[in-house]
């Protein structure tokens, strides 16, 4: 499988937003690339979001996706929004070179995203 690199650890912002770069080493001249973010908890793997893009064009996730992203060459900048403390976990970047053949697939080692829910503001009397 292709080599896919991603940071080991990312801390989500207080607004529940986490961003990281997923970079892949392409063996060939792909024109169509699919990027999928997977969350792994123990032996369970769930798909967080996915997007297919044409090289040179923007990465487009579905309207209701919690992910957004941009692409530049063999790099994809991914942002996951709406994260809560319970979403802390290992997020894996999966890259597939869909077209033209041959098909290549690469899996990153995963980014551990830590999410801390903000403390509620104490009531204050004025």
């Amino acid at each position: 499988a292709m080599h896919v690199a991603q940071p080991a650890v990312v801390l989500a912002s207080s607004r529940g937003i986490a961003s990281f770069v997923c970079e892949y080493a392409s063996p060939g001249k792909a024109t169509e690339v699919r990027v999928t973010v997977l969350r792994q908890a123990d032996s369970q793997v769930t798909e967080v979001c996915a997007a297919t893009y044409m090289m040179g064009n923007e990465l487009t996730f579905l309207d209701d996706s919690i992910c957004t992203g941009t692409s530049s060459g063999n790099q994809v900048n991914l942002t996951i929004q709406g994260l809560r403390a319970m979403d802390t976990g290992l997020y894996i970047c999966k890259v597939e070179l869909m077209y033209p053949p041959p098909y290549y697939l690469g899996i990153g080692n995963g980014t551990q995203i830590y999410v801390i829910d903000p403390e509620p503001c104490p009531d204050s009397d004025f």
């Epitope: 063996p27 032996s43 697939l105 690469g106 899996i107």
Partner: antibody, heavy 115, light 108 residues
Amino acid sequence: EVQLVESGGGLVQPGRSLRLSCTASGFTFSDNWMNWVRQAPGKGLEWVGQIRNKPYNYETYYSDSVKGRFTISRDDSKSIVYLQMNSLKTEDTAVYYCTGGMDYWGQGTTVTVSS
Amino acid sequence: DIQMTQSPSSLSASVGDRVTITCGASEIIYGALNWYQQKPGKVPKLLIYGATNLADGVPSRFSGSGSGTDFTLTISSLQPEDVATYYCQKILSPPPWTFGGGTKVEIK
């Protein structure tokens, strides 16, 4: 039209060597990781090994059953991949297929190891 | 090394039947799985790549599903020309890119 043509198979005695060749055409050879897959008579498919391409420094990988005996190499200028088989055993008897990625397959060449 | 276990090893079904073949990996392989069809006396042919993607020229009655460790190849309506042996293969690094043991499909 994509074509992969294997050659070099035949009858060989145990302990001897054989070199298989696979000539590719109809696709961008240099973009492909090339594999060898074999199939013993009446048996299933067995992945033998792989050679990656220039962006991956022509890394090679082998199944445990052939490691240390078989060597894969490639010549991108000629679009050929080779399988050098040394210290052959009777259990190496099989049809050997060359594949481009895993998308394109050759017709196979038969290797028989027997005394 | 990751082991690939296919079941059943053989099956017999009627024309028009829905046929399901399963492939299990001993570890998570994230959808890094191909399916191949090998008709008697012929060269194997790529059917499904990346667990779910139909290869060019493959009839739509074939489909692949699954993720993690459990994968399925489904033929929605078995045809006489589907008589073959079907193999799954793990395509996740590091190699070996192990094949399953195969499933022989016959017509009743």
